[in-house]
Amino acid sequence: EDELQVIQPEKSVSVAAGESATLRCAMTSLIPVGPIMWFRGAGAGRELIYNQKEGHFPRVTTVSELTKRNNLDFSISISNITPADAGTYYCVKFRKGSPDDVEFKSGAGTELSVRAKPS
């Protein structure tokens, strides 16, 4: 039970177009050392949404930046949601490696559905 768990509490989240969507993720441990990444979809064709270590993700804000919640919280908020953002999002923990980090554990995924913007 001491082994790290990647917790994504919501199985599904629904948000109106134009709003921001918060996708929640937390770790139960800081070990092993390594970055967190968020992907949409699974397998070889998955799309990188956020990389804690590097990159520019203008629509993504980490929730811990907003709330200063804690260093085990890796929730993200995606702004200005459109129907194209629908899909299943995975929070993935990587173990620090050389030369490349190695995928260690994934959350169960959160399915994001997009509602029409309220009139």
Partner: antibody, heavy 121, light 107 residues
Amino acid sequence: QVQLVQSGAEVKKPGASVKVSCKASGYTFTSYYMHWVRQAPGQGLEWMGIINPGGGSTSYAQKFQGRVTMTRDTSTSTVYMELSSLRSEDTAVYYCAREGLYSSGWYIDVWGQGTLVTVSS
Amino acid sequence: DIQMTQSPSSVSASVGDRVTITCRASQGISSWLAWYQQKPGKAPKLLIYAASSLQSGVPSRFSGSGSGTDFTLTISSLQPEDFATYYCQQAVSHPFTFGGGTKVEIK
């Protein structure tokens, strides 16, 4: 101080809908998730779903999917829970409850006073 | 869904007694567990979060322990105001399920 004030008791007929409101005060409304939990007479607590008042995103328990709608009005710091197609088994006290900011886990730290919804023909 | 099983469903005790309530999760939830106290006609009140952390303002006679699937709430010396129903709740996965409750009654 942090307070959640809910609307008053309701009596509804089977098949009708009910909309319960919960007005928050004493904290930044958009920074804290809000849960809805119900309790049938003499029974335990049942989690219904959650809304993020910041972006308006919602997540519902499978049991209530398609029957429940949670919304918010940031101008009045109020969240709403609407339950449709009411049946007698929906007779319960409905609570809104704020999720606090904790270092490990997502826990409810403040509860509304509850709203009794009675479904009877 | 994660099932939460509480035992016993009720316990009769006297003022000053030590009372222990257990909660078992159907799968591992690390330490992501809360305990609530509810008195008749009132909303629940958070006592313990993260399995063992005491919520601000809660008397130190309440304590929690456990990790993984097995958890315990202990009241070290029962006071008259502690007669109530206690619920555990997992905070890992929606739906955030509660245990069935344990009613602490006066012997």
